[in-house]
């Protein structure tokens, strides 16, 4: 069990003095009601802070904003509002930071009552800005091409699609009545358009278009489109099937040149599809149940995105606000956590360690007792609070947290019982990617990971009292030290640290308030003197990921290989440093039937690892047919799980069967697709029907 603050811990010597010398206060002398932070570039130390203050007067809103810049990770800020001519910047999508380390920033100004708008753009990490008038009013944040930060895409409030090829200096209108637009790979743009004038009323009558040359030419790659999404190397479209209001998923891996029908159940108008996670190997797809059930089924795809295996039933995904607890645990390969809605209507957490192959309840922490929800006081599980709990108003200040470079570490709010509890949650930490958990902190906290896991920082959530304490741990949450960063408590609003968890700096944001005065304040603490030496070879130890049984010579084998990591010893108090790279060594495992999924036309009977042929494909199963290239229609009954690297061992061989006789598919064929050169194409209407939230890749 993890000792808390009061028990004997490996205390860091003289930490109070060391932290006091590295605590930097900054007072923002403005009365703004909201503040937003953006990091510019990676390891640059540059932060932009936008404070905004809005007052509605009759039919219009009077607003004021201020812009501040730091180049030392938030220790000091300079007011640079004059660089943007004291213009009011929109707080909702006002700051757009360029990809990678481009140093590009676009600020979108709010020019009320105008037919156009204004942006300020910087290419030098916000040292200087150039003002640019826009011939349109943006509907959403300007989108950078992931491949070229000079290429910008914008959707206007009149649903026009605009592109700039010179970082916003000049804009060209690509298309009218565009409902949704996205950058694909290689500077390709995908968008849906509707010639009938409305995006909201005519869902299912949209056309999907592609331009690979920034608008010189266009190609229709789909029709009768309800929605589309991109995930990994897959392009998905939900398409009306011609059977009333039903629609089905079609998938393309060649940018929409050819399509195959996904082997997924069709859905009606009150249901939805959602890509929960995707990479270049596979996709997690949620398919909503009919009716207002609040749950659906997770399916996992094969490497083509076509054949799907049922992964988890009764998966919680509310239709109202679109809340799901689905979380990719980025600190360990193959691990995902989500919630199910049980038959008794209770919400329960589930975890998978093998990319959705099997789901189990989370193991009860050693140092915790089952709460009142537990029928058996000895038998219960840990349940994780995520987006659903936040949406229902529980005191959960943060979503679960994991970082790829902090191997194995997961931090989350949770409760221990038969189901998620409405009681005050505590903070739990796993150091092995979710296999085992320890109660780390009593009550709700904000938390963050610094120095690739070398330090974990937390601040207690206290809505009614001011905050002046920060807690930190140098041993992955086993022991905690408390530091008073100020004498006078502040009303705490959040923790901020540079994305990527490589920084040694943490900023505590809040405000002070008196009868006549309120101002924003930040305290930035640099932990460099706590971790005063660089880590050496002796500070790291070998750790086998996914180890559940050390005596098994297949221990740690997940998706056909095992990985040994060099991990910082809990007892080592040293700096991983900004340049820290996770050291891991993979080893291939022998194949077993668990490394294969059943191919199209085959299924696994319950409690059997063998794939057997479906007796007959009939009725609506015909909609699950594979369409496209010839090899899609041949199968040996088994297909390697996407990303599985096993070799040798079991190698299931089946006679190749031709399924062409059994089914057909009639989605838009490549020969029916049309192309056109640029000249503004017609159509009208507008809807932003796919949104990204909680890192969900696509929700219709």
């Amino acid at each position: 069990s993890a000792p808390g603050e009061d028990e004997e811990c490996g205390r860091v010597r003289d930490f109070v003095a060391k932290l006091a010398n590295n605590t930097h206060q900054h007072i923002f002398n403005d009365l703004s009601g909201s503040v937003s932070l953006s990091w510019v570039g990676d390891s640059t130390g540059v932060i932009l802070v936008l404070t905004t203050f809005q007052v509605p007067i009759f039919m219009i809103t009077i607003g004021q904003s201020k812009l501040y810049r730091s180049e030392d990770y938030g220790k000091n800020f300079k007011d640079i509002t004059d660089l943007i001519n004291n213009t009011f910047i929109r707080s909702d999508f006002g700051i757009a930071i360029g990809p990678e380390n481009s140093g590009k920033v676009v600020l979108t100004a709010d020019v009320s009552g105008s037919h156009g708008s204004r942006i300020f753009r910087s290419s030098d990490f916000a040292k200087n800005f150039v003002q640019q008038e826009l011939p349109f009013v943006p509907l959403m944040q300007i989108m950078y091409s992931p491949q070229n930060s000079d290429y910008l895409l914008a959707l206007s409030n009149k649903n026009e699609l605009w592109v700039s090829k010179n970082f916003g200096g000049k804009w060209e209108k690509l298309y009218d009545t565009v409902c949704l637009a996205k950058w694909g790979s290689d500077n390709t743009i995908f968008f849906t358009a509707n010639h009938n004038g409305s995006c909201s009323n005519d869902r299912g009558m949209l056309e999907l278009w592609r331009t690979s040359d920034l608008g010189k030419s266009f190609k229709t790659i789909g029709s009768k489109i309800y929605s589309f999404g991109l995930g990994g190397r897959f392009l998905f479209a939900s398409v009306m099937t011609g059977k009333g209001t039903l629609r089905a998923i079609h998938v393309s891996t060649d940018q929409g040149d050819t399509w195959s029908m996904a082997q997924l159940p069709p859905v009606g108008h009150e249901q939805f599809y959602s890509i929960l996670a995707a990479n270049d190997d596979m996709v997690f797809m949620h398919v909503d149940e009919p009716g207002d059930s609040g749950f659906g089924t997770i399916f996992t795809s094969d490497d083509r995105g076509i054949v799907y295996s049922k992964s988890l039933e009764r998966h919680l995904y509310t239709t109202t606000g679109g809340e799901t607890d689905f979380t990719n645990v980025t600190s360990l390969r193959g691990v995902y956590i989500t919630s199910i809605l049980a038959e008794d209507k209770s919400v329960q957490s589930m975890i998978t360690f093998d990319q959705g192959g099997r789901w189990t309840h989370l193991r009860k922490p050693e140092n915790s007792k089952c709460d009142a929800t537990a029928r058996d006081p000895e038998k219960c599980s840990l349940h994780i609070h995520a987006a659903y709990s936040i949406a229902t108003g529980l005191n959960v200040p943060m979503l679960p947290l994991s970082e790829p470079n902090a191997v194995g570490i997961v931090i989350a709010h949770g409760s221990v019982g038969d189901a998620i509890s409405v009681m005050r949650p505590d903070v739990y930490i796993s150091d092995d990617g979710g296999y085992s958990w320890t109660k780390a902190l009593e009550g709700p906290h904000h938390y963050t990971i610094l120095d690739s896991g070398g330090i974990i920082v937390a601040v207690e959530q206290n809505a009614h009292q001011g905050v002046n304490q920060i807690k930190f741990s140098t041993d992955e949450g086993q022991c905690w030290q408390t530091y008073n960063f100020t004498k006078d408590p502040i009303f705490f609003t959040g923790l901020a640290s540079e994305p990527g968890a490589r920084s040694m700096n943490i900023s505590i944001w809040g405000y002070r308030s008196s009868l006549f005065h309120q101002y924003w304040i930040s305290y930035t603490i640099d932990f460099k003197d706590i971790l005063e030496r660089n880590c050496e070879e002796k500070d790291y130890t070998i750790w086998l990921a996914h180890s559940t049984d050390p005596e098994d010579y297949e221990d740690g084998c997940i998706l056909g290989y095992k990985e040994q990591f060099l991990r910082l010893r809990k007892s080592s108090v040293c700096q991983n440093g900004r340049d820290y790279v996770v050291t891991k060594q993979p080893s291939i495992c022998l194949c077993s039937l668990e490394d294969f999924l059943c191919d199209f036309g085959y299924y696994r009977p319950e409690n059997d690892s063998k794939c057997v042929e479906q007796p007959e494909l009939k009725g609506h199963d015909l909609e699950f047919c594979l369409y496209g290239r010839e090899e899609h229609l041949t199968t040996n009954g088994y297909r390697k799980i996407p990303g599985d690297k096993c070799q040798g061992g079991v190698n299931p061989v089946r006679e190749v069967k031709d399924l062409k006789k059994k089914c057909t598919s009639n989605f838009l064929s490549p020969e029916k697709q049309n192309s056109k050169s640029n000249g503004s194409a017609g159509g009208s209407g507008g809807l932003n029907d796919i949104f990204e939230a909680q890192k969900i890749e696509w929700h219709e």
Epitope: I542, L544, P550, D555, S587
Partner: antibody
């Protein structure tokens, strides 16, 4: 003192059988995987067989599969190797070795070995 | 099966000299590589486990390094008592295998 002592070796004719024993002391025998490793005269080391602490996992080298059987008795702190259908190429010193407790661990404790000679 | 190729087969070295023995695996075995010393008419003894971790009681002149497929055992300043055969061993994948051995003799 942590110790492994092998016994049961000797001269046997091809096709014959022999049962080797390994007596463990000085550690909690029931917590460790145990192994047999052999070494032919003037040659290198060759792994023969492995058994987990509770006998859940048993592994053999292809060269002995179907002929040799590994077993253990945790109550008696003893490891065994039943060798049937012996061949001339099974002639070797047979060592009993403890595997460390980590995943994919090394053989940290070895016995002094017992000689098995298969000859007509 | 994973084949471990040890080199050299034989080395004749003067005391205080540095000895380097390499072991190459036919495929990646991560850090699951161990080194043993076997003196004439004795059983093997563990020197290094998991590629670089010294086993308790082993003199500090013995060290190991490497990962994946290439591994090295170094004896920093050879002593007369180090005359022995040295074997590498992989525990990453069944069947467990050993290298062919390197015999170190004192000049």
């Amino acid at each position: 003192e942590v110790q492994l002592v092998e016994s049961g070796g000797g001269l046997v004719k091809p096709g014959g059988s022999l049962r080797l024993s390994c007596a463990a002391s000085g550690f909690t025998f029931s917590s460790y995987s145990m192994n047999w490793v052999r070494q032919a005269p003037g040659k290198g080391l060759e792994w023969v067989s492995s058994i987990s602490s509770s006998s859940s996992y048993i592994y053999y080298a292809d060269s002995v599969k179907g002929r040799f059987t590994i077993s253990r008795d945790n109550a008696k702190n003893s490891l065994y190797l039943q060798m049937n259908s012996l061949r001339a190429e099974d002639t070797a010193v047979y060592y009993c070795a403890r595997r460390g407790s980590g995943s994919y661990d090394a053989f940290d404790i070895w016995g002094q070995g017992t000689m098995v000679t298969v000859s007509s | 099966e994973i084949v471990l190729t040890q080199s050299p087969d034989f080395q004749s070295v003067t005391p205080k000299e540095k000895v380097t023995i390499t072991c190459r695996a036919s495929q990646s075995i991560g850090y699951s590589l161990h080194w043993y010393q076997q003196k004439p008419d004795q059983s093997p003894k563990l020197l290094i486990k998991y590629a670089s971790q010294s086993f308790s009681g082993v003199p500090s002149r013995f060290s190991g390094s490497g990962s994946g497929t290439d591994f090295t055992l170094t004896i920093n300043s050879l002593e007369a008592e180090d005359a022995a055969a040295y074997y590498c061993h992989q525990s990453s994948s069944l069947p467990l295998t050993f290298g062919g051995g390197t015999k170190v003799e004192i000049k």
